[in-house]
Structures are given as C-alpha cells and as structure tokens.
Interface confidence: low
C-alpha cells in the first residue's frame, strides 16, 4: 500500500503514468484518480469509462499494464495521481505517483553590474537576469565551472592576468531543461565590444560553443 | 605589499565559542574573495570557508556547517570566523588566505591557534 | 568530492640532489588546475605553482610543475638548504577545493 514515485516532466510532452511492477492477476477493477476523488478513467467489466474531467480528451487507459497516458501536460496538471486496483479477492491495492510538470526555462540575459580596474586586476559583477523563474545557476569562465558555492544569479570574481577568462556563461536549469548566456570580456578589463553590453554565442560568429552536452554532463558529475 | 595577519585564537572548552580576525592590507579588500583554512597539529590543510569580496556569497566545508559563520566588513579591511559548539577535532592553525579567483590561495597569513580541550 | 594523493610521504635528501614528488586525484582534474605549495615548520603554505605548470611571482626556477588529468608532478631540479619543508598539492578544477596529504622533503 501506498508506494509513492515521483516523476518531472517538461510541460507540453506527452506523459505515461505506470507502475514498475505487474498489476494483479485478474483484478476486477482499476482506477486512475487525480488527488484523492476525482476520478479519470475506470476499467471494469473489460471497458474503460472516461469520466469528465480536464484529461478528457487527453488521456488514454492501457489495462493491461495499468499504463495511463496523457498528452501535452500543463504545470496545472501537477499533482498526486493514485491508481486503486479492486482484486478478486475484495481487497484493494494503491500505487500513487507525483507528477511535476516544469515550463522549460527561458534564455537568460548577463548584465553587467561592474566592471573596474583593481590593483591591476579586473574586478567584474554580472548578474544571471531570467523572469521570476524557480532555477538553478552554475557560472562557467571559458567553460571550467565556478565553485558550487557561486551558484546564484550573482557572479562576483577578481581576474588576475594570468587566470583571465574571456567569456562568462550563465547556465539556468531546473529539472527538465537549461539555458545558457554569454558575455565576454577583452583584457584587461573592458566589454569585448565597447558598443554593446550584451555579446551573445551567436554574436560570436557560431565559431565558439562555449559548453558542449558533454561538458556539461562531465561538470555536473564532479 | 599583501599582508594577513590573524587574531583571536586560544584555549576554548568543548562546546565553547571562539571568533578570529584577520586584517588585510595592501590590496583592494572588498574585491576580493576570502577564505579560511586549518591545519590540526601535525596534520595536513583542510579548507574551512569561503566568502566573496562582498560579503554576499559564503560556504563551508561540511565538518564545520551549522556551527562556523564567515563574514567581514569591508570598511574595516577585516575577515572574520566565528565559531560555536567548538569540538576537539577543531583544534588547529587557523590560516586567512586571500583566494585567487576563487581557484588557490595566495598569499596566506601566519595562523592562528586554536585548541578546545577540557 | 576529488581526493589527492601525494606521494611520497616523507623523502630523505641531501641538498643538490634532485626530487620528484607525485600528487594523483581520483578523478581527471579539469584544464591542471592544480597547485603546489611549500610549508616550512612554524611557517604559512606559500604558493609555488599554479596551472599545474606555472610558478608563482618570486619562486625560483627550480621549481617547476608539470602533468595533466590525474597525475601531477613537481620537481625541485637541485634541492637547495631552504627548500626542505612540506609541500603539499591542491585541486581547483572542482568545488570543494581540495589538498593532498602533503609530503615531507627531509634532509638525509
């Protein structure tokens, strides 16, 4: 009773709801629940009933497995989803899974808060811009990443000039996606481009992916 | 020239509290990142934490988490640790060191001793 | 987190000679962002190489760094008087940053 899974999914995909076990050997019933009551799907007496809801429309039932289907998933379909299996033998048996549906994040936009000569050295400010989005942030100089304790939308750092990096990337990310943003720098310590304050890896000609999938899938099993 | 000199170090019963300093000269102070790392007697270097040249970032290793706080006051070109529910296994020098783009240290200062015993 | 592991642990020595000292991680440190650094009894770590290959202002020409991925050398071409001490390595290609256990350059 009560085995709970949870699930991310990106909005707008299609998701299938199923156990990783197989359902009881000719159960009498099965039924799909949103939260606790509500019903979406029953199965008895070999047909499914569609009961009116929301997934309406969307959803699919496959009895044999149990498997729930539901297409193009919206951050309102987040919730608890319960399947109550009735056995031959009158007793009942539950599955529930957590379904969190996540909008993919937005392209963030660097700015540059400060930029000053210090001690021969460049002292820089850039804040990670996205709109109210619930993200995480990793901050990359020419691709090594900073320290985890950096990861904000603040990345505040004093260049020396034999560790210069040249471009600063923003990686937002939540559970289903990842963004990146690109400044960069000329030495000693001024914009690559005086004239604009945001330079951009398309701005850069193509020429320089700054992170490859597999960078990042490298940096984030440090 | 960079200088860093530490203060503040003793002896301190378990579960006592401690606070060091360290003032910083020769060097823009508040841009700079900080940070904190020990040596118990005999032993090798374990960095403790860290604190960016605003004060606005900090972290810790996971053996003092909870009972250490870095913070400075850039107006005063001064680090400081404070340090609570102190335990025999934090017995050590206690080094500031101006952190590198947050990659080594350089320079350091000349430690601080800090033993906790009964 | 990456662990460092220097080797060896102590070396007997007499000055002019010279030393190799190993530091291995247990996993590829990204770009050799990897330091040396020299203690002397009583004494602060003083940075000697940065980049696992670049000595730092001030440090003689003796000193030098090399290596890449997970393994990592510094060698003390003639070991001069002042130059017995501990020296340890650092990782900072990764967070936390780390050290190796350091190892002990005594004289014989």
């Known amino acids: 009773q009560g085995h709970l899974v949870h699930m991310t999914v990106v909005s707008g995909s299609n998701v299938t709801l199923n156990i990783s076990e197989s359902l009881p050997e000719n159960y009498k019933q099965l039924t799909w629940f949103y939260t606790f009551d509500q019903k979406i799907v029953e199965w008895d007496s070999r047909k499914s009933k569609y009961f009116e809801s929301k997934f309406k429309g969307r959803v699919r039932l496959d009895p044999q497995s149990g498997a729930l289907y539901i297409s193009k998933v919206q951050k309102e379909d987040n919730s608890t989803y319960i399947m109550r299996v009735l056995k031959k033998t009158g007793n009942e048996q539950e599955w529930k899974i957590k379904l969190q549906v996540l909008d993919p994040v937005p392209k963030p936009v660097i700015k540059i808060e400060k930029i000053e000569d210090m001690d021969d050295n460049c002292y820089l400010k850039l804040s990670c811009v996205i709109p109210g989005e619930s993200v995480n942030y990793t901050w990359y100089g020419d691709k090594r990443p900073f320290p985890k304790e950096l990861q904000n939308s603040v990345l505040e750092t004093t260049l020396m000039p034999h560790n210069y990096s040249r471009c600063y990337t923003c990686q937002v990310s939540n559970s289903v996606s990842s963004k990146n943003g690109t400044v960069c720098l000329s030495p000693p310590c001024t914009l690559a481009r005086s004239e604009q304050k945001l330079i951009s890896e398309e701005d850069l000609g193509g020429e320089q992916k700054l992170i490859s999938e597999e960078d990042l899938h490298h940096h984030h099993h440090h | 020239e960079v200088q860093l000199l530490e203060s503040g170090g003793g002896l301190v019963h378990p579960g006592g509290s401690l606070r060091l300093s360290c003032a910083a000269s020769?060097?823009?102070?508040?841009?700079?990142?900080m940070s904190w790392v020990r040596q118990a007697p005999g032993k090798g270097l374990e960095w403790v934490s860290l604190?960016?040249?605003?004060?606005?970032?900090?972290y810790y290793a996971d053996s003092v988490k909870g009972r250490f706080t870095i913070f400075r006051d850039n107006s005063k070109n001064t680090l400081y640790l404070q340090m609570i529910s102190l335990r025999a296994e934090d017995s050590a020098v206690y080094y500031c060191?101006?952190?590198?783009?947050?990659?080594?240290?350089?320079?350091w200062g000349q430690g601080t001793l800090v033993t906790v015993s009964s | 987190e990456i662990v460092l592991t220097q080797s060896p642990g102590t070396l007997s020595l007499s000055p002019g000679e010279r030393v190799t000292l190993s530091c291995r991680a247990s996993?590829?440190?990204?770009?050799?962002?990897l330091a040396w650094y020299q203690q002397k009894p009583g004494q602060a770590p003083r940075l000697l190489i940065y980049?696992?290959?670049s000595r730092a202002t001030g440090i003689p020409d003796r000193f030098s760094g090399s290596g890449s991925g997970t393994d990592f050398t510094l060698t003390i071409s003639r070991l001069e008087p002042e130059d017995f001490a501990v020296y340890y390595c650092?990782?900072?290609?990764?967070?936390?940053?780390?050290f190796g256990q350091g190892t002990k350059v005594e004289i014989k």
């Open positions: 060191a101006k952190y590198s783009n947050y990659d080594y240290f350089d320079p």
């Open positions: 650092q990782q900072y290609g990764s967070s936390p940053r780390t």
């Open positions: 604190i960016s040249g605003s004060g606005g970032s900090t």
């Open positions: 996993q590829s440190v990204s770009s050799s962002y």
């Open positions: 980049g696992a290959s």
């Open positions: 020769g060097f823009t102070f508040g841009g700079y990142a």
